[in-house]
Interface confidence: low
């Protein structure tokens, strides 16, 4: 799986999981949240060549497409797979609420 | 829906659904399908602005990010949504056979 | 109907930067890879570069680090800058469509098609 | 430096004869048939007639026709017609070069 296992040990040009923290404030300009001030979101990056971790079929057939036609901008591309939510803490007026946001956080990826 | 009804119609420069016929034999180097020749795959392609047609929580904060840290390469991509599958006609010696290959069409588009 | 028109000025004085641009219609930029390719009085044609459908710009070798492509797509508009120009880089300068193939966008086929008009460029003081 | 080279540099038949017009790439093509034949004609710009070394641009005679593979490559034009003579260029596309593109120096084909 290209997962933090993997992906951050490993130096990986082709798709794979990168380390992104971010600063909800200085990042994303959202004030609100109270607490965490920032998480480690990830993302996915990398190229994607013929067989790397194809999602489906047709991310196969484009890989193999890209190979014979290489400078054809249909190709596919390395994007989230497994996500997972963040547990916030922010106020409403003086009122203290914890919610969960889903898919917040990238855990592996995949060819698209 | 970024789909054929709206891409093909409209000059877009973010995310869409691309035409893209393929020929089996030409641009796969498959010969071992009979029918059909090649097939109407699309891809998806073009930019990922900040709530263009986001899939998840994560790709909405990624392409906020990318707003404020624009030379950063933590930016959504454009992938496929829906997929549609082919039937296929090829020969094992000289019995024909029919197979849906799943996944094979691209029918609307995402940024992830 | 497909049509690519090249225009700029036809004089340009050596050492300086020559620019011109292809204005399209009948298809979209983001759909189409363009091409420049040049031809000197009475000689060959010689590829200068492209600018793909997704954006990528690629250029022959002898023009790397001299030339830039660029496109508007809003605008219909190709541009070509060629920097440093000396009386070696007169000619007549085409811009050129990559033809499309049974939907497929055919890159490397070279298959340039349709063509421009050319726009003589003339480098002297 | 990828190298196109044409042969005869000129031909001079009469109407109705054949021409036989060659094309020699120092790497091989892409795909080993990506590779164009195009006419020109004094005060105009070139014209496709055929690409991926056989197929017949739409709206040419068939009287051109294309052949060869990976280096070598022929244009034939079967019968000459009065309007056939002018200057032909072959161009190839490469992969894995900064020069994805190279035309030959031309073969100027001339009434007898």
């Known amino acids: 799986a290209l997962d933090a296992a993997y992906c951050f040990r490993n130096v990986q040009d082709n798709c794979c999981l990168r380390p992104l923290y971010i600063d909800f404030k200085r990042d994303l300009g959202w004030k609100w949240i109270h607490e965490p001030k920032g998480y480690n979101a990830n993302f996915c990056a990398g190229a994607c060549p013929y067989l790397w971790s194809s999602d489906t079929q047709h991310s196969r057939v484009l890989s193999l497409y890209n190979t014979i036609n290489p400078e054809a901008s249909a190709s596919p591309c390395c994007v989230s797979q497994d996500l997972e939510p963040l547990t916030i803490l922010y106020y409403i007026g003086k009122t203290p609420k914890i919610e969960q946001l889903s898919n917040m956080i990238v855990k592996s990826c995949k060819c698209s | 829906a970024l789909d054929a009804a709206y891409c093909f119609r409209n000059v877009q420069d973010n995310c869409c659904l691309r035409p893209l016929y393929i020929d089996f034999k030409r641009d796969l180097g498959w010969k071992w399908i009979h029918e059909p020749k090649g097939y109407n795959a699309n891809f998806c392609a073009g930019a990922c602005p900040y709530l263009w047609s986001s899939d998840t929580q994560h790709s909405r904060v990624l392409s906020l990010y990318n707003t404020i840290n624009p030379e950063a390469s933590a930016s959504p991509c454009c992938v496929s949504q829906d997929l549609e599958p082919l039937t296929i006609l090829y020969y094992i010696g000289k019995t024909p056979k029919i197979e849906q290959l799943s996944n094979m069409i691209v029918k609307s588009c995402k940024c992830s | 109907e497909v049509q690519l028109q090249e225009s700029g000025p036809g004089l340009v004085k050596p050492s300086e930067t020559l620019s011109l641009t292809c204005t399209v219609t009948?298809?979209?930029?983001?759909?189409?890879?363009v091409n420049w390719i040049r031809q000197p009085a009475g000689k060959g044609l010689e590829w200068i570069g492209y600018?793909?459908?997704?954006?990528?710009?690629y250029y022959a070798s002898w023009a790397n680090g001299r030339v830039t492509i660029s496109k508007d797509t809003s605008k219909n508009q190709v541009s070509l800058k060629l920097s440093s120009v000396t009386a070696a880089d007169t000619a007549v300068y085409y811009c050129?469509?990559?033809?499309?193939?049974?939907?497929?966008?055919?890159?490397?086929?070279?298959?340039?098609?349709?063509w421009g008009q050319g726009t003589l460029v003339t480098v002297s003081s | 430096e990828i190298v196109l080279t044409q042969s005869p540099g000129t031909l001079s038949l009469s109407p109705g004869e054949r021409a036989t017009l060659s094309c020699q790439s120092s790497?091989?093509?892409?795909?080993?048939?990506?590779l164009s034949w195009f006419q020109q004609k004094p005060g105009q710009a070139p014209r496709l007639l055929i690409y991926?070394?056989?197929t017949l641009t739409s709206g040419i005679p068939d009287r051109f026709s294309g052949s060869g593979s990976g280096t070598d490559f022929t244009l034939t034009i079967s019968r000459l017609e009065p309007e056939d003579f002018a200057v032909y260029y072959c161009?190839?596309?490469?992969?894995?070069?900064?020069?994805?593109?190279?035309f030959g120096g031309g073969t100027k084909v001339e009434i007898k």
């Open positions: 790497q091989s093509v892409y795909n080993n048939n990506y």
């Open positions: 991926g070394a056989s």
């Open positions: 050129a469509r990559h033809m499309q193939v049974g939907g497929a966008p055919t890159g490397s086929m070279a298959a340039f098609d349709p």
């Open positions: 600018i793909s459908y997704g954006g990528s710009a």
């Open positions: 161009a190839g596309g490469y992969s894995g070069s900064s020069d994805k593109y190279a």
């Open positions: 009948g298809f979209s930029l983001s759909s189409y890879t």
